[in-house]
């Protein structure tokens, strides 16, 4: 790879547990998306909260390591947790610059892979993302 991985960086107000330390923020000014150059991986992530057919971005940034899913060229979110009734967290990992800027599509919350009644589930390395 010729360049270090660069991802979109965003953390919604009220989100606990910052991933800012997983990269170096680029000075992009105010009108552009914030960008972060990953320190420990070549992998971006994104987390969206889907509530009543409305998706809201919760976090975007660098992952702390390269793990399964990071080889994806695009952000294809999968359902990960139910932080509250009627809402579902979708996360993606991908391995191209700014691939976490937006998602290709969101599967319906009830699709296979959605955690059931056992409550929130976090894939390895995702625990920091779940502290919302």
């Amino acid at each position: 790879p010729p360049n270090r991985r660069t991802c979109v960086f965003f953390e919604a107000p009220g989100v606990r547990g910052s991933t800012k330390t997983l990269g170096e923020l680029l000075d992009t000014g105010t009108e552009l998306p914030r960008a972060i150059r990953c320190l420990y991986s070549r992998c971006c992530f994104g987390i969206w909260n889907l509530t009543q057919d409305r998706a809201q971005v919760e976090m975007q940034g660098c992952r702390d390591s390269d793990e399964p899913g990071c080889e994806s060229l695009h952000c294809d979110p999968s359902p990960r947790a139910h932080p509250s009734p009627g809402s579902t967290l979708f996360t993606c990992s991908c391995g191209t610059d700014f691939c976490n800027a937006n998602y290709s599509h969101l599967p319906p919350p009830g699709s296979p892979g959605t955690p059931g009644s056992q409550g929130p589930q976090a894939a390895p390395g995702e625990s920091i993302w779940m502290a919302l």
Partner: antibody, heavy 113, light 112 residues
Framework: QVQLVQSGAEVKVPGASVKMSCKAS????????VSWVRQSPGQGLEWIGE????????NFNEKFKGRVTLTVDKSTSTAYMELRSLRSDDTAVYYC??????WGQGVLVTVSS | DVVMTQSPLSLPVTLGQPASISCRSS???????????LEWFQQRPGQSPRRLIY???NRFSGVPDRFSGSGSGTDFTLKISRVEAEDVGVYYC?????????FGQGTKLEIK
């Protein structure tokens, strides 16, 4: 095939500005960083900065921050670099490059009173 | 800034003989993601630079296999197994691990 074609040579007086272009073809322009590098007469190479055409995010060598603006026109797959407050030591050949794998032919900028 | 120091600065070589260029960085070029962002470029007289090697040892497409790169940390080497007439020019190492990215001062290869 991948090509980067740069604009023509420029002669400027100290204090002036110069804006040069770099037209890309043969690949998806928005998928690769465009870097700018300069080479002063008889000297080595110096990295100026880079821009990601898809979203306009750029990253600069601190030495040039405040004097350089990098922009793109996605509709024509063209990158631009503007250098302001020119000094005689800005006399150099300026290259654009697609993530350093393909390079333009260079623009000679001469700054002289 | 990370200083890239090349040696020798001038390299006279006989056609068909091997050549070796050394590049030392003032800081380790191994990044936190496990990659080392070290590249080698060739600049023939009157031409734009051309990438030969990226990631220390990966040959760029179209680059003859007589060119090879090696090294780690702060010490890197570009080797040409058998020098040909078209190899004449200036060779630069380059690091993209630290901002600002920096080039070595160049090694001029000429035919003896």
């Amino acid at each position: 095939q991948v090509q980067l074609v740069q604009s023509g040579a420029e002669v400027k007086v100290p204090g002036a500005s110069v804006k040069m272009s770099c037209k890309a073809s043969g690949y998806t322009f928005t998928d690769y960083w465009v870097s700018w590098v300069r080479q002063s007469p008889g000297q080595g190479l110096e990295w100026i900065g880079e821009i990601y055409p898809k979203n306009g995010v750029s990253n600069f060598n601190e030495k040039f921050k405040g004097r350089v603006t990098l922009t793109v026109d996605k509709s024509t797959s063209t990158a631009y670099m503007e250098l302001r407050s020119l000094r005689s030591d800005d006399t150099a050949v300026y290259y654009c490059t697609r993530q350093r794998d393909y390079w333009g032919q260079g623009v000679l900028v001469t700054v002289s009173s | 800034d990370v200083v890239m120091t090349q040696s020798p600065l001038s390299l006279p070589v006989t056609l068909g003989q091997p050549a070796s260029i050394s590049c030392r960085s003032s800081q380790s070029l191994e990044y936190g993601d496990g990659y080392t962002y070290l590249e080698w470029f060739q600049q023939r007289p009157g031409q734009s630079p051309r990438r030969l090697i990226y990631g220390v040892s990966n040959r760029f497409s179209g680059v003859p296999d007589r060119f090879s790169g090696s090294g780690s940390g702060t010490d890197f080497t570009l080797k040409i197994s058998r020098v040909e007439a078209e190899d004449v020019g200036v060779y630069y190492c380059f690091q993209a691990t630290h901002d600002p990215n920096t080039f070595g001062q160049g090694t001029k290869l000429e035919i003896k």
